[in-house]
Amino acid sequence: TQNKALPENVKYGIVLDAGSSHTSLYIYKWPAEKENDTGVVHQVEECRVKGPGISKFVQKVNEIGIYLTDCMERAREVIPRSQHQETPVYLGATAGMRLLRMESEELADRVLDVVERSLSNYPFDFQGARIITGQEEGAYGWITINYLLGKFSQKTRWFSIVPYETNNQETFGALDLGGASTQVTFVPQNQTIESPDNALQFRLYGKDYNVYTHSFLCYGKDQALWQKLAKDIQVASNEILRDPCFHPGYKKVVNVSDLYKTPCTKRFEMTLPFQQFEIQGIGNYQQCHQSILELFNTSYCPYSQCAFNGIFLPPLQGDFGAFSAFYFVMKFLNLTSEKVSQEKVTEMMKKFCAQPWEEIKTSYAGVKEKYLSEYCFSGTYILSLLLQGYHFTADSWEHIHFIGKIQGSDAGWTLGYMLNLTNMIPAEQPLSTPLSHSTYVAHHHHHHHHHH
């Protein structure tokens, strides 16, 4: 049923997050007269598109229209008809499409072209589909969580909106884990950002922020698993890969062609004398952790300190919100509580990975086996990435907050993206009269808009 126009003066915005494993549509709403205030925009709907990420449609672009239909129709229902024409729609594609573009710019353009044509058919104000950079993804995630946590607000509150909120204006760092990439973004403490590629300067609500960000392409949880399999099959020399990252008794046949399909496994590619191999789980956290560590090259670092693969990382500073797959995986494993120490998390992972596959299937009967089978790897990967990749310690682990939603809005890059593109984050403190567009952060300070 079509909603009646609401009496209050509200605005809506739609952002589609075209990730590597799936697409999600988010609908945001805010009071029109308060759009320059911090923390007024909130999410009213999330619609998960059925099917894989858009990069998987490269050989069947004609199916993209049908793929997007359900969620776009849902948006039509949620947003009053009178608002349709003025509701902006943005689609941002992330690492799955970055990888496709690395393989073929032409194929990536073809997919985006069909996506644009499909989205143009709806009565909304379609603003375009594009592949956002890893830097943007990190920056917008950081903006989202700090906007929702009220960190940009000048009014100091005597109460906290969320349980883990520190009652000060220090921003939270952002840790984002996707299927194909992972981002780390934070304000370092008086530290020179030694690598210009990792430096962002923002002026938001009258305050300057020097932000460090990096996106590790191929180090999202799904691509990291492909990398690990490709690395391990090199030395397995057998059609059977006994894998410590899967539960004992788990078996799965993998096509070598699928393994080498992604650019992320190119460095491990070799001619194998078989077309398929079988993963046999042996469920050993410690061995899984060791195997994952081999994906991180820590021997090369041209800076004062690095994360891995020669990428500069300043000393960690302050609290961090860990969202997207960091949250989904840890939530499934029941490890998101603030009270769970890193040692406890490791202990729980050891127990979980060692559980027989048949037992796991019975315990989590409602969960799709494809996802269920990968939680041991994903949980171990998260620990390896945070501890050895980003150099969190048992102590600084206490500063990681696994966040799904803040104030009912999903933590992720989409809200920050929309706030920027709709000029809703002013560079200066909002005055009583609206500011001209030239003073907005989008125009002056988003150095990360340059295409690479």
């Epitope: 030395v235 020399s237 057998n238 059609e239 078989f274 050993n284």
Partner: antibody
Framework: EVQLVESGGGLVKPGGSLKLSCAAS????????MHWVRQAPEKGLEWVAY????????YYADTVKGRFTISRDNAKNTLFLQMTSLRSEDTAIYYC????????????WGQGTTLTVSS | DIQMTQSPSSLSASLGERVSLTCRAS??????LNWLQQKPDGTIKRLIY???TLDSGVPKRFSGSRSGSDYSLTISSLESEDFADYYC?????????FGGGTKVEIK
């Protein structure tokens, strides 16, 4: 209990042929890759050949390539090494060992069978 | 081919003594390394796999470690049954290659 028992060694003249066997028991033979490794008198260990569980992969040391053939019969839980054009430097104790990544790489070895190549 | 250089080639030690053997890989083997023990009767037994993981049933006095391309086997306190030949084996690539061996003898 895992057991690997080699047999078929003996005295052969240079240029001659011989087939070694390795009988496996106590584990699922068809899941494991298998190796032959040898040790010449008073020398160290030298890897000779490998065959994967389903026989689709075979690797050989350069010193035996073209002369030795590794094979297996999963139904009979037996590994073989067919040796032709034998030379005096092939004289050694021949061991078979099983192999399964991640944690069973050459983890169990047979007691060895002796080949002597001499005129 | 990856060369494995093992040292020393032999050593004499007393019961209760701590001994270390080393293997250096000519190329990166990423921890894909076993330590094997060969008794005087020819019996071969794997002691350690993946550079540092002790095989089940192997006494805790044996330990393996890695420092860059150097891999070590340490016996913390020699016992009479430890007098044997020891070999390292890399399984990072084919051909599989062994170190030259270390003979541990009673002083």
């Amino acid at each position: 209990e895992v057991q690997l028992v080699e047999s078929g060694g003996g005295l052969v003249k240079p240029g001659g042929s011989l087939k070694l066997s390795c009988a496996a028991s106590g584990f699922t033979f068809s899941d494991y890759g298998m190796h032959w490794v040898r040790q010449a008198p008073e020398k160290g260990l030298e890897w000779v050949a490998y065959i994967s569980s389903g026989s689709s992969i075979r690797y050989y040391a350069d010193t035996v390539k073209g002369r030795f053939t590794i094979s297996r019969d999963n139904a009979k839980n037996t590994l073989f090494l067919q040796m032709t054009s034998l030379r005096s430097e092939d004289t050694a104790i021949y061991y078979c060992a099983r192999d399964l990544y991640y944690d069973h790489v050459l983890d169990y070895w047979g007691q060895g069978t002796t080949l002597t190549v001499s005129s | 081919d990856i060369q494995m250089t093992q040292s020393p080639s032999s050593l004499s030690a007393s019961l209760g003594e701590r001994v270390s053997l080393t293997c250096r890989a000519s190329q990166e083997v990423s921890g894909y390394l076993n330590w094997l023990q060969q008794k005087p009767d020819g019996t071969i037994k794997r002691l350690i796999y993946a550079a540092s993981t002790l095989d089940s049933g192997v006494p805790k006095r044996f330990s393996g470690s890695r420092s860059g391309s150097d891999y070590s086997l340490t016996i913390s306190s020699l016992e009479s049954e430890d007098f044997a030949d020891y070999y390292c084996l890399q399984y990072a690539s084919y051909p599989r290659t062994f170190g030259g061996g270390t003979k541990v003898e009673i002083k």
